[in-house]
Interface confidence: medium
């Protein structure tokens, strides 16, 4: 069946960048790193300089729900985290600038950001039951839960 967002006409408008140059660590204290030009993976690092630094941009939706909707960009690049399907790796999509408005199939660029204590979860707007996740010996992907790890700690001000 078509993803939830594609069936609705919700429009997401860019507000502002709300976090700059932060690191995402999973529950095993693995940091997200670049696997190659297209994919991300997770690894335990001694030196956090090797971790990917992300910027987070906030969007507000036309249906005015209370969910916090964000885009994730690799800092100092034009690469944006993009969801595919379940158990598929998230892609890094190059765009000339941050989209001012997102709707329809482009919602694969957006994630609902939820926090519970120090745990942060990023649910795909295009696939609302799937989270950004790390998986042993695999790329950062979309997953519904275990054995993939779906909770992250945000490490700020690592520069």
């Amino acid at each position: 069946s078509a993803p939830f967002s594609f069936l609705s006409n919700v429009k997401y408008n860019f507000m502002r960048i709300i976090k700059y140059e932060f690191i995402l660590n999973d529950a095993l204290n693995q940091s997200i790193i670049r696997a190659n030009d297209q994919y991300l993976t997770a690894a335990a690092l001694h030196n956090l300089d090797e971790a990917v630094k992300f910027d987070m941009g906030a969007y507000k939706s036309s249906k005015d729900d209370a969910k916090i909707t964000v885009i994730l960009r690799i800092s100092k690049t034009q690469l944006y985290v993009t969801a595919q399907d379940e158990d598929q790796p998230v892609l890094l999509k190059e765009m000339p600038e941050i989209p001012k408005t997102i709707t329809g199939s482009e919602t694969n660029l957006l994630f609902f950001w939820e926090t519970h204590g120090t745990k942060n979860y990023f649910t795909s707007v295009a696939h609302p039951n799937l989270f950004i996740a790390t998986k042993q010996d695999y790329w950062v992907c979309l997953a519904g839960g275990p054995p993939s790890i779906t909770d992250f700690q945000i490490l700020e001000n690592q520069a």
Partner: antibody
Framework: EVQLVQSGAEVKKPGASVKVSCKAS????????MNWVRQAPGQGLERMGW????????TYADDFKGRVTFTLDTSTSTAYMELSSLRSEDTAVYYC???????????????WGQGTTVTVSS | DIQMTQSPSSLSASVGDRVTITCRAS??????LNWYQQKPGKAPKLLIY???RLKPGVPSRFSGSGSGTDYTFTISSLQPEDIATYFC?????????FGQGTKLEIK
């Protein structure tokens, strides 16, 4: 320890301009926007706008557009607010306040300067 | 602009009392509400963000609740050092307006 230290009190004549400084320390300046808020004597708080310290881009509240300018000196981690064409009703305490995006609250202000009193009088 | 209306504008209470302040928004602000404390001659301090989340280091006697347009700030047991003016602020839509403040005094 996060600190925002503002410049001293100013007395200005109507029609003049005033420039208030806000020197930040104890954190990475570029990662947190800077808001400017004013408080007239015995009154509430009025947000004048903010400057993105990462990009230098300013956003001004409608009531201040055309009269206020926010600038930065990133080398000294200092933000500035200049208000022109001063009138008596601009007499107020002016605060800088660090912007933090706490989860779910756009533009929460978690650390504030001590305030700068600006008096406009002929 | 979203209007924020606080009540009461002032109140007097005794040490140990439970104190409640309300804040009403002119439209739904989706829980994006902050509370600040301002002591005389000092700058405001952030106490609560996103309706009910305490800023780290803020005593647990302070709490917040609400949804939609109606929000409440509570001090469960008033302490002498809580004498201040309290402001709500909506974090939903620019220009991120404040309530007019509630001045809290000790009986």
């Amino acid at each position: 320890e996060v600190q925002l230290v503002q410049s001293g009190a100013e007395v200005k004549k109507p029609g003049a301009s005033v420039k208030v400084s806000c020197k930040a320390s104890g954190y990475t300046f570029k990662y947190y926007g800077m808001n400017w808020v004013r408080q007239a004597p015995g009154q509430g708080l009025e947000r004048m706008g903010w400057i993105n310290t990462y990009t230098g881009q300013s956003t001004y509240a409608d009531d201040f557009k055309g009269r206020v300018t926010f600038t930065l000196d990133t080398s000294t981690s200092t933000a500035y607010m200049e208000l022109s064409s001063l009138r008596s009703e601009d007499t107020a305490v002016y605060y800088c306040a660090r912007d933090i995006y706490y989860y779910g609250s756009d533009f929460a202000m978690d650390y504030w300067g001590q305030g700068t009193t600006v008096t406009v009088s002929s | 602009d979203i209007q924020m209306t606080q009540s009461p504008s002032s109140l007097s209470a005794s040490v140990g009392d439970r104190v409640t302040i309300t804040c009403r928004a002119s439209q739904d602000i989706s829980n994006m509400l902050n509370w600040y404390q301002q002591k005389p001659g000092k700058a405001p301090k952030l106490l609560i963000y996103y309706t009910s989340r305490l800023k780290p280091g803020v005593p647990s006697r302070f709490s917040g609740s609400g949804s939609g347009t109606d929000y409440t700030f509570t001090i469960s047991s008033l302490q002498p050092e809580d004498i201040a003016t309290y402001f709500c602020q909506q974090g939903k839509t620019a220009p991120y307006t404040f309530g007019q403040g509630t001045k809290l005094e000790i009986k």
